[in-house]
């Protein structure tokens, strides 16, 4: 190899200034004896290399970009040979941000996977390789001391969330839990969380039925429509408030809204919808009166109110 | 402290009736599901029935279903279990207990002892 | 309903002895299986609940593990207080069924 090129820093904030040396052999004895040393920066050649000879013979070349404003490029130093350019040396130069602080970090049990999600905003394009890392510890009070540390977790690439596994997760006691993002550039923190998981735990919806008539009820009213649910079982035991949401199915109607439905209801008569007409329904339950997230809408049921009787 | 005391057990003939009683302090009662569980000699535990915080939700074993009433006084802090039609196989020690969100018995009273026989 | 088989039945033990019991599911329960230990004449004590969360005031040396169908109860340690039964109870759903318990014995 007849050149080398070192550089100031290989990555740097975009925009800033970058100086880089490349420095050709004395054997390189096909070459001029004062051989001129051009700089390129992709294909672009770039003026304003100083050029010296050293002391050990050497040539050596110094540049100076202003700024560098491509995300990604290649310098290189070259000599003219011939009619052509001979490239002695490049390096990749990378241009970026230090990440950004990851922001609205949010989390939620799922207690089917029996694993804590937390998902979070990564902020602006770096323009750099960033890794993010979700780091939590135990914490027997509200997060000021911290306890036992949980094994981080890294989500795949690109991913802006990431799974802690139950056997990390100790219930009904708090966990501080933040984010960290760092490329070559800096590194960043997210403000820290200071959750029990068990506050945070999303449910499964019931699942929304008709209610089977029995032969002493009386058959409902026209406009209304006899509901019931049956809950999601492994979530039983955990007191929680629910709603319903209907509508039309033709039309352009939006949903409405009706709710809390009577606390440990899991029957429900459903009054002033027009008669005649199909209905969509959907219900949703939260943890309540406990923190918790509300469940996503169950699957819909399809329903259609009686005639009203002829006068 | 959390604490539950059951009573209301005893002797009684076969296709009798008994009412157990638990009462609990220590704890908002009315937050939380209670449910009883039974142990026949030597035997294991064998749930029997729970019920919901406010006492609408009360799903039973099948072995005591249409002959248990599970019930509950949230103003006295009490739990019931009416037991009728009592047959041999429900001579066991029943424990009164709070039921967890994620369905664990945590703490448990001392027990009652009911033994059917003629 | 969802059967729940613990094995084994019996075991003796040596203080200082690691113990291993394991109840398995007759269907996926995820993480709803709970442990207890009961003494002769006493009601049972929670140990472990969701699998592997410890209640509190329980020794370490007791620790859960497993999920879906497969669960495991390790003591790390026998101590003498630690001679009982030990039942494992599924949660997921109604009817609430419990193992037919392990009677640990000392050897």
């Known amino acids: 190899e007849c050149g080398h090129i070192s550089v100031s820093a290989p990555i740097v904030h975009l925009g800033d200034p970058i100086t880089a040396s490349c420095i050709i052999k004395q054997n390189c004895s096909h070459l001029d004896p004062e051989p001129q040393i051009l700089w390129r920066l992709g294909a672009e050649l770039q003026p304003g290399g100083r050029q010296q000879r050293l002391s050990d013979g050497t040539q050596e070349s110094i540049i100076t970009l202003p700024h560098l404003n491509h995300t990604q490029a290649f310098l290189s130093c070259a000599l003219n040979w011939g009619n052509s350019l001979q490239i002695l040396d490049q390096v990749e130069l990378r241009a970026g941000y230090p990440p950004a602080i990851p922001h609205n970090l949010s989390c939620l049990m799922n207690l089917t996977t029996s694993s804590l999600i937390c998902q979070w905003e990564p902020g602006p394009e770096t323009h750099l390789p960033t890794s993010f890392t979700l780091k939590s510890f135990k914490s027997r009070g509200n997060c000021q001391t911290q306890g036992d540390s949980i094994l981080d977790c890294v989500p795949k690439d690109g991913q802006s969330h990431c799974s802690i596994p139950r056997k990390h997760l100790l219930l009904y006691q708090n966990m501080g839990i933040w984010v960290q993002a760092e490329n070559a550039l800096g590194t960043s923190m997210s403000p820290q969380l200071c959750l029990d998981p068990m506050d945070v735990v999303k449910l499964e919806p019931p699942m929304l039925r008709t209610m089977d008539p029995s032969p002493e009820a009386a058959p409902p009213q026209a406009g209304c429509l006899q509901l019931s649910w049956e809950p999601w079982q492994p979530g039983l035991h955990i007191n929680q408030k629910c709603e319903l949401r209907h509508k039309p199915q033709r039309g352009e109607a939006s949903w409405a809204l009706v709710g809390p439905l009577p606390l440990e209801a899991l029957q429900y008569e459903l009054c002033g919808l027009l008669p005649a007409t199909a209905y969509t329904l959907q219900i949703r339950c939260i943890r309540w009166p406990l923190p918790g997230h509300w469940s996503d809408w169950s699957p819909s049921l399809e329903l259609r109110t009686t005639e009203r009787a002829p006068t | 402290e959390v604490q539950l005391l059951e009573s209301g057990g005893g002797l009684v003939q076969p296709g009798g009736s008994l009412r157990l009683s638990c009462a609990a302090s220590?704890?908002?009662?009315?937050?939380?599901?209670m449910g009883w569980v039974r142990q026949a000699p030597g035997k294991g535990l064998e749930w029997v029935s729970s019920?919901?915080?406010?006492?609408?939700?009360?799903p039973y074993a099948d072995s005591v279903k249409g002959r248990f009433t599970i019930s509950r006084d949230n103003s006295k802090n009490t739990l019931y279990l009416q037991m009728n039609s009592l047959r041999a196989e429900d001579t066991a020690v029943y424990y009164c207990?709070?039921?967890?969100?994620?369905?664990?018995?945590?703490?448990w009273g001392q027990g009652t002892l009911v033994t059917v026989s003629s | 309903d969802i059967q729940m088989t613990q094995s084994p039945s019996a075991l003796s033990a040596s203080v200082g002895d690691r113990v291993t019991i394991t109840c398995r599911a007759s269907?996926?329960?995820?993480?709803?299986l709970n442990w207890y230990q009961q003494k002769p004449g006493k009601a049972p004590k929670l140990l472990i609940y969701y699998a592997s969360n410890l209640q509190n005031g329980i020794p370490s040396r007791f620790s859960g593990s497993g999920s879906g169908t497969d669960f495991t109860l390790t003591i790390s340690s026998l101590q003498p207080e630690d001679f009982a039964t030990y039942h494992c109870q599924q949660s997921y759903s109604t009817p609430l069924t419990f193992g037919g318990g392990t009677n640990v014995e000392i050897r």
């Open positions: 019920i919901s915080s406010s006492g609408g939700v009360t």
């Open positions: 269907q996926g329960i995820s993480s709803y």
């Open positions: 207990a709070m039921l967890g969100e994620l369905g664990w018995f945590d703490p």
């Open positions: 220590g704890f908002t009662f009315s937050l939380y599901w």
